[in-house]
């Protein structure tokens, strides 16, 4: 069937439309286009004869139409009047006619809209605002956007006038937003520039900050006032009802008790004509004297002297407080407070008692702190430490030993080699050492204030060849699933690699095995009975390698759940009952038996000759491992038939 398709159906003014013919019959003589829904000679646009390929304009031809050999009609530079129906009249060779009608609609290209408002400065909770989208356009749809979102649902928002007008009733400050309108028709859509709604509001009740209402004499008073308001509020301050100044901040330096009173901030909005006030009561307290600490012993000796610290001045009806290391006083039998808490006594001072110490005097407002006091506790010297900890050195390297002993005042140091004094320094340096530098190295530390001396001796071996190492352990009898064991490969040697083997194999990968201390220490976490193996450590350097003798780990475990054998539970009267109990355990467990809950013998084997039905019952074997402190048991029922 002959049909007409309009492409497009909705046409913008000034554009073009193609009336496309479908299912055109065969063997045509010609065809004509007419404006309207029927064939009317007065409204013919154009005719076309196929044989001559001649197009003939009709009365309705505007010069903007082009007819194609396939009968399709193109209309250019479309005007509003072109809207409507178009009829194609087809004349077939057999002079039988056929008709088809199509249509399209013409719409204007919309201009960019704008928003007009009936109130540019509405007042919060009082005014309404009506926005209108201009211009008014036929066949256009109107849409509204707030902050680029579609309109929220609100009883205060109303659309009217075909959605062209948006009214906001009883505006609030939250309506301060970007508003846009949009016009749409089938051929175009345009959005306006945004209009910002400027809602006048406030002032709200002002806030005075800081919230603090108590001050000390001599401090500066700096109050700030803020009230939400549009336009911003104008501020005034009143003290005890008397006007002070028209500023947002009130500053009074070096206040006295006389500055106590009521402080009022007034906020005024000139556009809304509203005023709001807030009052705060300020109290100024007199400044007490700053406390300080006196001591009866400025250089106490550790473990010998006591020190009494006193908080000055003495003030009646005052609470005294103390702090050590910025913490309140710890509970300690060596710390004593006097009845009024004014004196703190440290009995038998230690080096850890240096402080700092602070005392405080409490008043109505706050606590006044003294300056911190540090005790100069004389102590030491402790046993000196010689570092590094290496005992083996390679020939040709430099030997640099450092000695340190905890001491106050700092210790004076001396070095001796094989008993011969070398130098009075903290560090001993010998370059390019040889085997002859092997020997006993002694560091002597001396405290001139206490007169005490302490020494440490270290054996240094100079050799490129490493000695046979040995393994030391921090736990010779670890308990299964409980203890950890740390093996350390001795000695500690410079420029040395440490290696480990278990049962002659290199270390297995296990989260329970950890190497540390430059691989010198092997730690087994949560030991199990399977860890009871031979452990060997090795040391190597550039010229030698050596292995220790094996150390076998003795893991204490068990007792596991015991097993009673034989498994039989039925016996004939007159038979011998011979039960044996076994439990995996290291060391071997202690065994005991109970029959029907009654203790029997402490043996691994329970023997009863010529049993009778009287021997029916429950037979329990109990095992205990004194080393692990663990116990276990099992119960077996025995039936004796007559």
């Amino acid at each position: 069937k002959l049909t007409i398709e309009s492409t497009p159906f909705n046409v913008a003014e000034g554009k073009e439309v193609l009336l496309l013919v479908h299912n055109l019959p065969q063997h045509l003589f010609g065809y004509s286009w007419y404006k309207g829904e029927r064939v009317d000679g007065n409204r013919q646009i154009i005719g076309y004869v196929i044989g001559t390929q001649q197009a003939t304009p009709g009365p309705a031809y505007s010069g903007r139409e082009i007819i194609y050999p396939n009968a399709s009609l193109l209309i250019q530079n479309i005007i509003q009047n072109d809207t409507g129906f178009y009829t194609l009249h087809v004349i077939k060779s057999d002079l039988v006619n056929e008709e088809a009608t199509g249509q399209f609609r013409v719409y204007p290209e919309l201009p960019k809209p704008s928003i007009s408002s009936n109130n540019s400065k509405p007042v919060e909770d009082k005014d309404a605002v009506a926005f209108t989208c201009e211009p008014e356009t036929q066949d256009a749809t109107y849409l509204w956007w707030v902050n680029n979102q579609s309109l929220p649902v609100s009883p205060r928002l109303q659309l009217s006038n075909g959605n062209r007008t948006l009214t906001l009733f009883n505006v609030t400050r939250n309506d301060t937003a970007s508003y846009k309108c949009e016009t749409q028709n089938p051929v175009s859509a345009r959005r306006s520039d945004s209009v910002i709604l400027n809602v006048l509001y406030g002032p709200d009740a002002p806030t005075i900050s800081p919230l603090n209402t108590s001050y000390r004499s001599g401090e500066n008073l700096n109050l700030s006032c803020h009230a939400a308001s549009n336009p911003p509020a104008q501020y005034s301050w009143f003290v005890n009802g008397t006007f002070q100044q028209s500023t947002q901040e009130l500053f009074i330096p070096n206040i006295t008790v006389n500055n106590s009173g009521s402080y009022t901030c007034q906020a005024h909005n000139s556009d809304t004509g509203l005023n709001r006030t807030t009052v705060t009561t300020i109290t100024v307290y007199a400044e007490p004297p700053k406390p300080f600490i006196t001591s009866n012993n400025s250089n106490p000796v550790e473990d010998e002297d006591a020190v009494a610290l006193t908080c000055e001045p003495e003030i009646q009806n005052t609470t005294y407080l103390w702090w050590v290391n910025n913490q309140s006083l710890p509970v300690s039998p060596r710390l004593q407070l006097s009845n009024d808490n004014r004196t703190l006594t440290l009995l038998s001072v230690t080096r850890n008692d240096v402080g700092p110490y602070e005392c405080g005097i409490q008043n109505e407002l706050s606590v006044d702190h003294s300056d911190p006091v540090i005790l100069n506790v004389l102590y030491g010297p402790d046993d000196p430490t010689i570092s590094p900890s290496y005992t083996y050195y390679r020939p040709g390297v430099n030997l640099s030993l450092s000695c340190h002993a905890a001491s106050n005042p700092p210790a004076q140091y001396s070095w001796l080699i094989d008993g011969n004094i070398q130098q009075h320094t903290q560090e001993l340096f010998i370059s390019n050492i040889t085997e002859k530098n092997s020997g006993l190295y002694t560091c002597q530390a001396n405290n001139s204030a206490s007169g005490h001396s302490r020494t440490t001796v270290k054996t240094i071996t100079v050799s490129a060849e490493l000695p046979k190492p040995s393994i030391s352990s921090n736990n010779s009898k670890p308990v299964e699933d409980k203890d950890a064991v740390a093996f350390t490969c001795e000695p500690e040697a410079q420029n040395t690699t440490y290696l480990w083997w278990v049962n002659g194999q290199s270390l297995p990968v296990s989260p329970r095995l950890q190497l540390s201390n430059g691989n010198r220490t092997l730690t087994l976490f949560n030991v199990t009975r399977n860890d009871a193996r031979a452990y060997v450590c090795g040391i190597q350097n550039s010229v030698s390698a050596n292995r220790s003798d094996p150390v076998t780990l003795d893991v204490l475990y068990g007792p596991d759940t015991p097993i009673i054998s034989p498994p039989d539970s039925s016996y004939l009267s007159g038979a011998n009952l011979n039960l044996s109990c076994h439990s995996a355990s290291n060391p071997s467990p202690q065994y005991s038996w109970r029959i029907n809950g009654i203790p029997q013998q402490h043996t691994q084997v329970l023997f009863i000759a010529k049993i009778t039905p009287n021997n029916n019952g429950t037979y329990a074997c109990f095992v205990s491992n004194l080393a692990t402190g663990r116990n276990n048991s099992i119960v077996k029922s025995i039936t004796v038939s007559a």
């Epitope: 020939p395 050799s463 060849e465 690699t497 090795g538 190597q540 390698a545």
Partner: antibody, heavy 120, light 106 residues
């Protein structure tokens, strides 16, 4: 298994220099030290020194300071010995050797030796 | 440097005979090590750290000593033991070898 393959014999003019190579297989040279030892005709063994391929640290016998230079190329698992200012007294078989770190010995693996002949 | 003196320079032994080679150090050392070298081959470690038998070495070889005096002993000489034996110290740099002892089969 562990093997040390040394480069072939060298004939060098007096005053010249030569670079010998020692390629390891069966282990990573970074895990050990490489020592060099020489043996003159009908003579005993002389230790030249060692190199740690992991960091390039070296130790030379005083006699060979300035005469021998050790280098390594860990990507090819090869150690090198460069000898300079050669004289007839440097005519010898040069061995590379090392001890694997997992074993308890050192000097337990030796190359087959490279013969260096210095001619006037 | 630590000079190692080996004696004898040459020794001949019949199969089954006991052989002892000594090594004297000019300065005391912790351990002594022994190598065997046959003509045209690389040295081979036989004893390490004074008394430990290297891998694959027959039990007839043994080592002992301390300080400056060390020895290598073959309990029963066999034909395959004919070689030159060197001692070595690794205590101090430079590492040094003895001049060698040539062991011949009688």
């Amino acid at each position: 298994q562990v093997q040390l393959q040394q480069s072939g014999a060298e004939l060098v003019k007096s005053g010249g220099s030569v670079k010998l190579s020692c390629t390891a297989s069966g282990f990573n040279i970074k895990d050990s030290y490489m020592h060099w030892v020489r043996q003159g005709p009908e003579q005993g063994l002389e230790w030249i020194g060692w190199i740690d391929p992991e960091n390039g640290d070296t130790e030379y016998a005083p006699k060979f300071q300035g005469k021998a230079t050790f280098t390594t190329d860990t990507s090819s698992n090869t150690a090198y010995l460069q000898l300079s200012s050669l004289t007839s007294e440097d005519t010898a078989v040069y061995y590379c050797n090392e001890g694997t770190p997992d074993g308890p010995y050192y000097f337990d693996y030796w190359g087959q030796g490279t013969t260096v002949t210095v001619s006037s | 440097e630590n000079v190692l003196t080996q004696s004898p320079a040459i020794v001949s032994a019949s199969p089954g005979e006991k052989v002892t080679i000594t090594c004297s150090a000019s300065s005391s050392v912790s351990y002594m090590h022994w190598f065997q070298q046959k003509p045209g081959t690389s040295p081979k470690l036989v004893i390490y750290s004074t008394s430990n038998l290297a891998s694959g070495v027959p039990a007839r070889f043994s080592g002992s000593g301390s300080g400056t005096s060390y020895s290598l002993t073959i309990s029963r000489m066999e034909a395959e033991d004919a070689a030159t034996y060197y001692c070595q110290q690794r205590d101090s740099y430079p590492l040094t070898f003895g001049a060698g002892t040539k062991l011949e089969l009688k």
